[in-house]
């Protein structure tokens, strides 16, 4: 299986690092070569290296190649960081486990099992052999480490130092039994890099010999570094694809942990009489699907078949035949006991009321003194007093520490959508509690709509490019893909940030979308040059009611002539009545014959009364919303639309002033639209901005 | 105006294969999905899956997969389904319909359909 | 795969008479992604609402729909007699696609 082109499978990346040797002693050997490939073949065979290579640095720079008789483990080396520097370390060199009989064992071990110290391979005392390391050219008979150079039972072994004892192997684990996994490995995180056949596994970063779309940088957190084996797709067990071209993938074989506790992140707040977000933690004992058909038996094949039982699927609770929710569904579900109905939704398990009785606040919650400490997705809050410096970051004066006590959902930087709190996770540094404005409380929490005091335009002035305003530049405009199809607009607000509505994720597994940006066309016929696909790492939903989402793109957009970003407007600023503003989208436009390009639809600024009153009174808009009405009759947003923005021009600063979502009816005549205010929740954007983590490009 | 004209009726024995047609007319066969649809008496209308004629992109429901496959050539606006390793359960209305350029939008057009029947 | 149950499965009504037919998703569906077709006997479906309200091109105004969640309907305010079909709901909120098994509205 150990073809030529993939020995760069045999070694560990560390990427922006390079090693520096302290000891002048060491050598090292460099050349111009194309790809880190080169490197890794050249490295393997020792071809033309005055030295056993164990590991090497590819500049991407210079398009060279440094090879090493030594790694970041050896004396008289340090590791260093460098952007254009990737180091690969033999995994042989640096393993401390065996892969089936250990010929390949390159490690360190030099007693044996007994514990008897072993003698040098060059040496022959006290026992005389004819294991010389050069007859025994890249087996690494080394000073005295153990070896298995003719691949023998027992694993690797060694002469000892004790003239009463010829040889002795050595204690060393087989790499299945030193890993292991909690659950299905989700979150197993270890160097396993072989099948439970021992095929060797594929480099997540190669698409040789197979072709897949788990590519480390779409995926920064699934863990997919080298050739290791992962679950970011909720299999059973950790598996990977392989260098056997006749099989794509399989399982490994890594053993679950004796203490098979997950980890704290990975916890599903469990519930049993109610739903709580998804139902992934619902551990409840509703055993009939919504219409009342009973379940089938998780541990049942019959009457169908199929692989969500309790060994695979060890910490999903598969009891009985309750409803449960393994694997990221929309909500707990079951196979039934009806042939003909495969599978089916508990729907009727309620959700959880997360207003907690009486508790609620008024105005903007700063006042806030109660106890609860969950945030609404279930998190438990984080002590504030271990969050300090990060609340230091984002307000500009200094919190009233009285009221920081324990984990309480607090507002201490004023913001308008009411307490919330830190959660220790480092993917959702925060969020929102789950209390609820008091009833009757009409404190406003923004300055009055009434009165345009407060301008929406920052100071700056639109960025010309060669003398020429950028007017006609859409750039931020954002085609959100739900497998292979757009099904929403987004605006690119920031280089790994695109704000949208909620209503355009029916599922909640982010594999199955994509943003495309810098496309004129839907499908993007005629954009290759300009588009740029990129991956969803998360989702960050609005507060409570304003139905905006802000989706963390993986890796972030280049600016370039066909992508840029668009400018959020001030928090609580209102636009003047009449102001002209466009509404773009690749949504349904009624013509027997769509072109598939972007379009647009001009509209115009209306005041909320008013905007009212062309509903004919059947809606009353509030702060959180503003109405724009068409300019020509029968045109605005539709389907296919929803998450696009409202642009509006204020001093030659164009802005995203409003979101689409689902309204009354597409373009009624006379029926102005209503969009999500974005003015509004610009305060909440930026927070997001500022405290969530991005990746760096 | 938009229309599909689908192939005629076929016959065929257990174990063949047979290759149904869509002719599309009146818009821009590129930029529209093609959506297949089974009806069988006292089974309803079952979606098969899609095929995006300009990318040659797919989409299968999970239980037609390895049964169809789906093809389109650009230059004759048509689309193509084959059916393999027919079975009596194949016999059945197969319907071509346009569906949207985006997620969620509705079958807005259909071809008459052809009556494909399994019988040794 | 998201279950949708139409009710009832055949129904007749009087000329001038108001019906309305539901359809119920096992799963919570957007009402953007909830279409209604008519079928006569020997002709294909054909498109009659779209995103659970919007009437399709040529659909007479007396036929409504509405809904949202997991609870649809279709509705004429006043039967006439080329209203006689099967009316199948569809959802399009998730893979694989679904219709419903149809309800059959026959003269009275």
């Known amino acids: 299986q150990r073809k030529r082109r993939n020995t760069i499978h045999e070694f560990k990346k560390s990427a922006k690092t390079t090693l520096i040797k302290i000891d002048p002693a060491l050598k090292i050997k460099t050349k111009k070569v194309n790809t880190a490939d080169q490197c890794a073949n050249r490295c393997t065979r020792n071809k033309g290296l005055p030295f056993t290579c164990k590991a090497f640095v590819f500049d991407k720079a210079r398009k060279q190649c440094l090879w090493f008789p030594f790694n970041s483990m050896s004396s008289g080396v340090k590791k260093e960081f460098g952007h254009e520097f990737d180091l690969y370390e033999n995994k042989d060199y640096i393993r401390n486990c065996i892969i089936g009989k250990g010929r390949s064992y390159k490690g360190t071990v030099s007693i044996t099992k007994s514990g008897i110290k072993c003698q040098p391979w060059s040496s022959m005392i006290p026992h005389e052999h004819s294991f010389l390391p050069s007859s025994y050219r890249g087996k690494d008979l080394q000073e005295n480490y153990c070896r298995n150079p003719r691949g023998e039972e027992g694993g690797p072994w060694c002469f000892t130092s004790n003239p009463e004892v010829r040889y002795e192997v050595c204690d060393i684990p087989q790499c299945s039994e030193v890993e292991c996994m909690t659950c299905n490995g989700e979150s197993y995180r270890g160097l396993m890099d072989h099948t439970e056949s021992g095929k060797i596994c594929q480099r997540w970063d190669h698409q040789t010999p197979h072709r897949h779309k788990f590519l480390p940088e779409r995926y920064p957190d699934k863990g997919f570094d080298d050739n290791y084996c992962r679950n970011p797709d909720g299999q059973p067990r950790p598996w990977c694809y392989t260098l056997d071209p006749h099989t794509r993938w399989e399982y490994c074989a890594i053993k679950t942990c004796a203490d098979n506790t997950m980890n704290d992140t990975d916890v599903p707040l469990e519930t049993t009489e109610c739903i709580q977000g998804q139902g992934e933690g619902y551990r409840g004992t509703v055993n009939t699907i919504w219409n009342g058909i009973p379940c089938q038996r998780w541990d049942s094949q019959y009457p169908h078949e199929h692989d969500m039982t309790p060994e695979n699927f060890k910490c999903k609770d598969l009891r009985e035949n309750y409803c449960r929710n393994p694997d990221g569904s929309e909500s707990p579900w079951c196979f039934t006991t009806d042939p003909n109905i495969r599978v089916g939704y508990c729907s009727q398990i309620p959700n959880c009321d997360m207003s907690h009785g009486q508790d609620c606040y008024r105005g903007n919650g700063k006042n806030y003194m109660g106890n609860l400490s969950q945030t609404r997705s279930g998190l438990t809050c984080s002590m504030w007093d271990k969050n300090m410096e990060d609340l230091h970051r984002h307000i500009f004066w200094e919190p009233d520490a009285s009221k920081l006590n324990e984990n309480y959902c607090r507002n201490p930087d004023d913001d308008a959508h009411g307490p919330w709190c830190y959660t220790g996770n480092p993917l959702i540094p925060w969020d929102y509690c789950p209390i609820s404005r008091c009833e009757g409380d009409t404190t406003p929490t923004i300055v009055n709509l009434d009165h345009p005091v407060i301008s929406c335009a920052k100071t700056k002035q639109l960025r010309v490019v060669n003398g020429i305003p950028t007017r006609t530049n859409i750039g931020w405009m954002v085609s959100l893909r739900y497998r292979n199809k757009h099904i929403c607009g987004g605006s690119l607000i920031k280089e790994s940030w695109v704000l949208t509505a909620r209503q355009c994720f029916p599922s909640r597994d982010l594999k199955d979308y994509e943003a495309w940006l810098g496309i004129h066309d839907v499908h993007g016929r005629g954009d290759e040059k300009c588009k740029q696909v990129l991956n969803v790492s998360q989702l960050v939903y609005g507060p409570e009611g304003s139905d905006l989402v802000l989706m963390k793109l993986a890796r972030p957009a280049v600016l370039d002539d066909f992508v840029s970003t668009i400018d959020l407007p001030n928090y609580g600023c209102t636009i003047p009545e009449k102001t002209s503003c466009s509404v773009y989208g690749w949504g349904y436009t009624g013509l027997i014959n769509y072109d598939g390009l972007l379009r647009v639809a001009h509209l115009y600024i209306m005041g909320n009364e008013k905007c009212s009153q062309h509903h004919r009174g059947k809606v009353t808009l509030n702060e959180s919303e503003i109405c724009a009405g068409a300019e020509k009759i029968g045109s605005g947003p539709c389907e296919g639309d929803y998450g696009g923005p409202l642009v509006c021009e204020q001093h030659k600063m164009r802005m995203v002033l409003g979101v689409i979502v689902p309204g009354r009816g597409c373009a009624i005549p006379n029926r102005p639209g209503i969009f999500v205010r974005v003015a509004y929740y610009a305060k909440w954007i930026h927070k997001i901005i500022l405290t969530y983590k991005v990746p760096q490009s | 105006q938009v229309q599909l004209q689908q192939s005629g009726a076929e016959l065929m024995k257990p174990g063949a294969s047979v290759k149904l047609s869509c002719k599309a007319t009146?818009?821009?066969?590129?930029?529209?999905?093609i959506e297949w649809v089974k009806q069988r008496p006292g089974h309803g209308l079952e979606w098969i899956g899609e095929?995006?004629?300009?990318?040659?992109?797919?989409n299968y429901n999970e239980k037609f997969k390895g049964k169809a496959t789906f093809t389109a050539d650009t230059s004759s606006n048509t689309a193509y389904m084959q059916l393999s390793s027919l079975t009596t359960e194949d016999s059945a209305i197969y319907y071509c319909?346009?569906?949207?350029?985006?997620?969620?939008?509705?079958?807005?057009?259909w071809g008459q359909g052809t009556l494909v029947t399994v019988s040794s | 795969q998201i279950v949708l149950t139409q009710s009832p499965a055949i129904m007749s009504a009087s000329l001038g008479e108001r019906v309305t037919m539901t359809c119920t998703a096992s799963?919570?569906?957007?009402?953007?992604?909830l279409h209604w077709y008519q079928q006569k006997p020997g002709s294909s479906p054909k498109l009659w609402i779209y995103?659970?309200?919007n009437l399709a091109s040529g659909v007479p105004a007396r036929f409504s729909g509405s809904g949202s969640g997991t609870s649809y309907s279709l509705t004429i305010s006043s039967m006439e007699a080329e209203d006689a079909a099967t009316y199948y709901c569809?959802?399009?909120?998730?893979?694989?696609?679904?219709f419903g098994a149809g309800t059959k509205l026959e003269i009275k």
């Open positions: 569809h959802q399009y909120h998730r893979s694989p696609l679904t």
């Open positions: 095929i995006l004629p300009g990318s040659g992109s797919t």
């Open positions: 319909a346009r569906g949207g350029y985006y997620y969620g939008s509705s079958f807005d057009y």
């Open positions: 009146g818009y821009t066969f590129t930029g529209y999905w």
């Open positions: 995103s659970t309200s």
């Open positions: 799963s919570s569906v957007s009402s953007s992604y």
